[in-house]
Interface confidence: low
């Protein structure tokens, strides 16, 4: 089943998938527990940058950029994407403990979610389902096979034998060759016609490009090295049986002298650079919780120390049809609440020695924006807002209302579609914002919908600090301070002057400053001052004052 394509070229493999590379995984290791949907840890990765399919340059940590003594010169490029960096670009040896710094880029592309099952092995070293890496170009099988320099390509298991015929032109053999690929993936070469048989090659030359697979035993914590050769070779000191070297300790070099009756001295001295133990690596989710709805970050962690040169370790990830040669990857612009599958493997000196598969479900995304149907003022102290909820999952609403610089917010039940606002201030503009939120790994707020209304008018409050003072025998000066709450559109001060029950003056000013002249001498007056806002009068402030007996 082919991977599901996506608009931007990044896909997620449907199950079952195929091996990450052609290197066969260890099959005589202990069983693993099945994978469950990967639970994220609250861990942060600080050094991730954006991974784009167009980014052709992979940054390499130069610190292995260092002791060159163990460097493997084989360049490896991706079969699917020719511009992806080679292994040689992303790995170099080191005399120290330098490791590869992640400075790749993040896949900034749409990744199709994984359908169906979670039954994927979650433990490095083996998996029940495979991934979609192309044939591993570490040891590519080409159509022209050279016997003298043959390096067997281990291919995925097949149910029937595959025969490849290659005409071989070689310094040592000139023959038409039939190469049979057995289900185990080893190449069996049978010579059909030998044109010439010159002198034998040296074993040193014949096995110059010999490749090795390392198989790890979790019980003994030892490795077995499987020599990828087509005949049963002999090893000095009888160190191998059936082309396998057993009981190799992690991170220790072992020297094996290889010979065969088809070649002459000098023998090939093979240095086995044994990888670190499989259980010393853990695939860790490094996604920042704030971004867990649309991003996935995966990172291999060294959970135990080992003495292997970390510069010789390379990491490979496949998420969909995108392949990354980094210790850490970051995928961006993903769909919230979707499952994505990533396969990963670790290589030591370009030999795969462990792998893991993760299914990660992205977090709940931010809810959408609610749709406000209407919001208006019903009365001087009340308003109402009604809305339709957003489509996406959410837990509750937050309604905020702002008057001038004051802001009040309240949480509303997710089932509400209407809210009556009480105790509002009359004749005041209220700006309302309504957003849904969801409590996921962090609280995610949706976009806010906005609306506004102005409450109806109401009677203003009383003027205050009213004073009445005599300016002459028959004149008074009345002053007051504005009301605390005007509660309406206009501003007018009124003064009513009564003598007994008779209204003798009624004045209206823009300011509360009245000069009342020509009053009767020696008379008791009642002064009533109030504010009118254009719709309603306020409560009057009342003072009593008497004119004096004329002094003249």
């Amino acid at each position: 089943q082919s991977p599901t394509p996506s608009p931007t070229g990044l896909t997620t493999a449907k199950m079952p998938s195929v091996p990450l590379s052609s290197d066969p995984l260890p099959t005589h290791t202990t069983a693993f527990s099945p994978a469950s949907t990967f639970e994220r840890e609250n861990d942060f990765s600080e050094t991730t940058t954006s991974l784009s399919p167009d980014n052709t340059s992979t940054q390499v940590s130069p610190d292995s950029l260092d002791n060159a003594s163990a460097f493997n010169t084989t360049g490896v490029s991706s079969v699917q994407t020719p511009h992806l960096p080679t292994h040689a670009d992303s790995q170099t040896p080191s005399a120290g403990t330098d490791t590869q710094t992640f400075s790749g880029s993040a896949a900034n592309a749409k990744l199709n979610p994984t359908p169906g099952s979670n039954a994927i092995s979650d433990v490095p070293g083996e998996r029940s389902t495979a991934s979609t890496f192309p044939t591993d170009p570490v040891s590519p099988l080409t159509t022209t096979l050279s016997l003298a320099h043959h390096s067997s390509a281990a291919l995925p298991a097949r149910t029937s034998n595959t025969t490849i015929t290659a005409n071989t032109s070689d310094a040592y053999l000139n023959a038409s060759e039939t190469t049979t690929l057995s289900p185990s993936g080893s190449a069996v070469i049978s010579t059909t016609t030998i044109a010439t048989t010159p002198s034998k090659p040296t074993c040193d030359e014949k096995y110059a490009n010999i490749t090795v697979d390392y198989l790890y035993n979790k019980e003994t914590k030892l490795f077995t090295a499987k020599l990828n050769v087509n005949e049963n070779v002999e090893c000095g000191n009888n160190t191998c049986t059936n082309n396998e070297v057993h009981n190799l300790t992690e991170c220790k070099n072992a020297s094996v002298s290889i010979s065969h009756n088809s070649c002459t001295a000098p023998d090939k001295t093979l240095i086995l650079d044994v990888p670190p133990g499989v259980e010393k690596f853990q695939l860790h989710d490094c996604t920042q919780v704030e971004k867990a709805d649309t991003t996935i970050c995966l990172k291999w962690k060294n959970i135990e120390t080992f003495t292997c040169d970390t510069q010789n370790i390379t990491y490979r990830f496949q998420c969909g049809n995108m392949i990354f040669d980094n210790k850490e990857i970051k995928l961006e612009n993903l769909e919230p609440e979707h499952e994505y599958k990533c396969d990963s493997e670790i290589l030591y000196n370009n030999h795969k020695f462990t792998n893991a598969s993760k299914i990660i479900k992205t977090d709940f995304g931010s809810p959408g924006e609610p749709q406000i149907i209407f919001c208006r003022s019903e009365a001087a102290h009340q308003g109402v807002i009604t809305w339709n909820p957003p489509q996406r999952s959410f837990h509750n609403f937050t309604l905020c209302y702002i008057k001038e610089t004051e802001k009040d917010c309240l949480n509303l039940d997710k089932n509400l579609i209407k809210y009556d606002l009480q105790n509002l201030k009359p004749y005041t503009k209220y700006v309302l914002s309504l957003h849904a939120y969801i409590i996921a790994k962090v609280q995610r707020n949706g976009s806010a919908a906005m609306c506004h209304f102005t409450t109806k008018s109401a009677p203003p409050s009383q003027v205050w600090n009213m004073t009445v003072s005599m300016t002459s025998d028959n004149s008074m000066h009345v002053k007051c301070r504005p009301p605390r709450d005007r509660n309406g559109p206009h501003e007018r001060y009124h003064l009513e002057v009564e003598a007994g029950n008779t209204l003798v003056r009624n004045e209206s000013h823009k300011n509360c400053d009245f000069r009342v002249k020509d009053l009767q001498y020696s008379t008791d007056y009642t002064f009533k001052a109030y504010f009118h806002n254009g719709d309603y009068p306020g409560e009057p402030f009342i003072l009593h004052h008497s004119t004096s007996y004329n002094s003249k």
């Epitope: 260092d66 002791n67 060159a68 005399a95 490791t99 590869q100 710094t101 400075s103």
Partner: antibody
Framework: QVNLLQSGAALVKPGASVKLSCKAS????????IHWVKQSHGKTLEWIGY????????NYNEKFRRKATLTVDKSTNTAYMDISRLTSEDSATYYC???????????WGQGASVTVSS | DVVMTQTPVSLSVSLGGQVSISCRSS???????????LNWYLQKPGQSPQLLIY???NRLSGVPDRFSGSGSGTDFTLKISRVEHDDLGVYYC?????????FGSGTKLEIK
């Protein structure tokens, strides 16, 4: 005493190429990377790239990827840097330096001055 | 690229005095092995640069203990105590954790 001996000063015309050499002695040449560094007159140091003498593997500063080519001759323990399409901007002193995994650039050549002038 | 900014551009010190040179990076460059490959070099007049301190605070064999390096994250310092005449020249910091390797613009140390 580790020694990196560089070729002498060079006066070259614009558009031409120059090949600088760096001969290593008193250590195992293939055990250390060779890095190349540019120092324009009175200016700071700029890293050009490195080569693994054992494998021939190279890595370059993007700025110099089309300008410099690094090679080695293991038989003579010599590293080379070819600078092509020379302009006045390439006038500088170029240093070779060796590097291990733990200790970076612990030995430097004496520098090779390149002057580009018509 | 990791940009390295050195301050001051130059400084003058009396013999026997003490100086500090600051180096600030545009981003953290801790290598994934946990090491910070921040190095200090001295280029004496008319000579090639020479390594003084590697991995922030490790003195190269033969470098006097008057030279000390410190710092973490994006801020690093080279301290020279009991300055001698032989210490004059241009001091460079450089990071070797990320490609491309980058250097500071240099601090010229002069003797009063």
């Amino acid at each position: 005493q580790v020694n990196l001996l560089q070729s002498g000063a060079a006066l070259v015309k614009p558009g031409a190429s120059v090949k600088l050499s760096c001969k290593a002695s008193s250590y195992t040449f293939t055990d250390y990377y060779i890095h190349w560094v540019k120092q324009s007159h009175g200016k700071t140091l700029e890293w050009i790239g490195y080569i693994n003498p054992k494998s021939g593997f190279t890595n370059y500063n993007e700025k110099f990827r089309r300008k410099a080519t690094l090679t080695v001759d293991k038989s003579t323990n010599t590293a080379y840097m070819d600078i092509s399409r020379l302009t006045s901007e390439d006038s500088a002193t170029y240093y070779c330096t060796r590097r291990t995994g733990v200790i970076p650039m612990d030995a430097w050549g004496q520098g090779a001055s390149v002057t580009v002038s018509s | 690229d990791v940009v390295m900014t050195q301050t001051p551009v130059s400084l003058s010190v009396s013999l026997g005095g003490q100086v500090s040179i600051s180096c600030r990076s545009s981003q953290s460059f801790v290598s994934s092995d946990g090491n910070t490959y921040l190095n200090w070099y001295l280029q004496k007049p008319g000579q090639s640069p020479q390594l003084l301190i590697y991995k922030v605070s490790n003195r190269l064999s033969g470098v006097p203990d008057r030279f000390s390096g410190s710092g973490s994250g994006t801020d690093f310092t080279l301290k020279i105590s009991r300055v001698e005449h032989d210490d004059l020249g241009v001091y460079y910091c450089g990071q070797a954790s990320k490609i491309p390797l980058t250097f500071g613009s240099g601090t010229k140390l002069e003797i009063k």
